[in-house]
């Protein structure tokens, strides 16, 4: 089937980085500057994305792949292919319409992005608080109060803190 298709459609032989040029008897021509084709058999090349302004070039465009952008420091990428830049906050803060605001008591954020999340409730797992939470860090749960009675075995290692979620992409 592949051989038959090649005989019927000479364009299928054009590799990535070229296009099938109808103006030149369907021969494979290289993509012009600032354009690319990431797959074979294409009849046109796509225009390269330009990373302008606060969008910085992370990867230059080549004849076979589009440019990739990221955001100027102080902001981070959001959306497919870094279609948006969203501002960073400090740890212990979350982003709101009013800008970066401190996490409310009882919540934390250990990243520069995302939302403040409630501290782990150690008592739900029958454990005690070993290290208090802060705006930047979750509480650390220790052994249950019963484990701390005299003669009890050595302290069990704290349960790993739940990984905070990320802002929507």
């Amino acid at each position: 089937f592949e051989r038959t298709r090649s005989l019927q459609d000479p364009c299928s032989n054009c590799p990535a980085g070229t296009f099938c040029d109808n103006n030149r008897n369907q021969i494979c021509s290289p993509c012009p500057p600032n354009s690319f084709s990431s797959a074979g058999g294409q009849r046109t090349c796509d225009i390269c994305r330009q990373c302008k302004g606060v969008f910085r070039t992370r990867k230059e465009c080549s004849s076979t792949s589009n440019a990739e952008c990221d955001c100027t420091p102080g902001f981070h990428c959001l959306g497919a292919g870094c279609s948006m830049c969203e501002q960073d906050c400090k740890q212990g803060q979350e982003l709101t319409k009013k800008g970066c605001k401190d996490c409310c008591f009882g919540t934390f954020n250990d990243q520069k992005r995302g939302i403040c999340r409630p501290w782990t409730n150690c008592s739900l797992d029958g454990k005690s608080v070993l290290v208090n939470g802060t705006k930047e860090r979750d509480v650390v749960c220790g052994p249950s109060p019963a484990d701390l009675s005299p003669g009890a075995s050595s302290v069990t290692p704290p349960a790993p803190a739940r990984e905070p979620g990320h802002s929507p992409q």
């Epitope: 606060v54 959001l78 959306g79 279609s83 948006m84 830049c85 969203e86 501002q87 982003l95 709101t96 319409k97 802002s167 929507p168």
Partner: nanobody, 123 residues
Framework: EVQLVESGGGLVQPGGSLRLSCVAS????????MNWARQAPGKELEWVAN????????YYVDSVEGRFTISRDNANNSLYLQMNSLRAEDTAVYYC????????????????WGLGTTVTVSS
């Protein structure tokens, strides 16, 4: 083509005023939150202010609250930043930026940015 073009930057003395403008084209301006952000020399990009679609909600970074005023004119596809009582630390490139679809609900990402206008506050 979707585009934002800033103007109005320049050299001003401390305590002076300046009004920045941003003209939008290629999209329905009145359906988007709009923002100003700035980048001072050697510093990270910083959000400055935003305004909702009809201008009824406006928010500012603490450092400019009471000195800067953001406004918009949907009939003329224009965004403004009135800057009063300017200080040396306000020296920066100021960018106009469009809030992406869903801005304020699911994210605060800005998808279209101008190339900036330079404000220098110096005596």
């Amino acid at each position: 083509e979707v585009q934002l073009v800033e103007s109005g930057g320049g050299l001003v003395q401390p305590g002076g005023s300046l009004r920045l403008s941003c003209v939008a084209s290629g999209f329905t301006f009145s359906t988007h939150w709009m923002n100003w952000a700035r980048q001072a020399p050697g510093k990270e990009l910083e959000w400055v202010a935003n305004i909702n679609q009809d201008g009824s909600e406006k928010y500012y970074v603490d450092s400019v609250e009471g000195r800067f005023t953001i406004s918009r004119d949907n009939a003329n596809n224009s965004l403004y930043l009135q800057m009063n009582s300017l200080r040396a630390e306000d020296t920066a490139v100021y960018y106009c930026a469009r809030g992406g679809v869903g801005y304020g609900d699911s994210h605060f990402g800005m998808d279209v940015w101008g190339l900036g206008t330079t404000v220098t506050v110096s005596s």
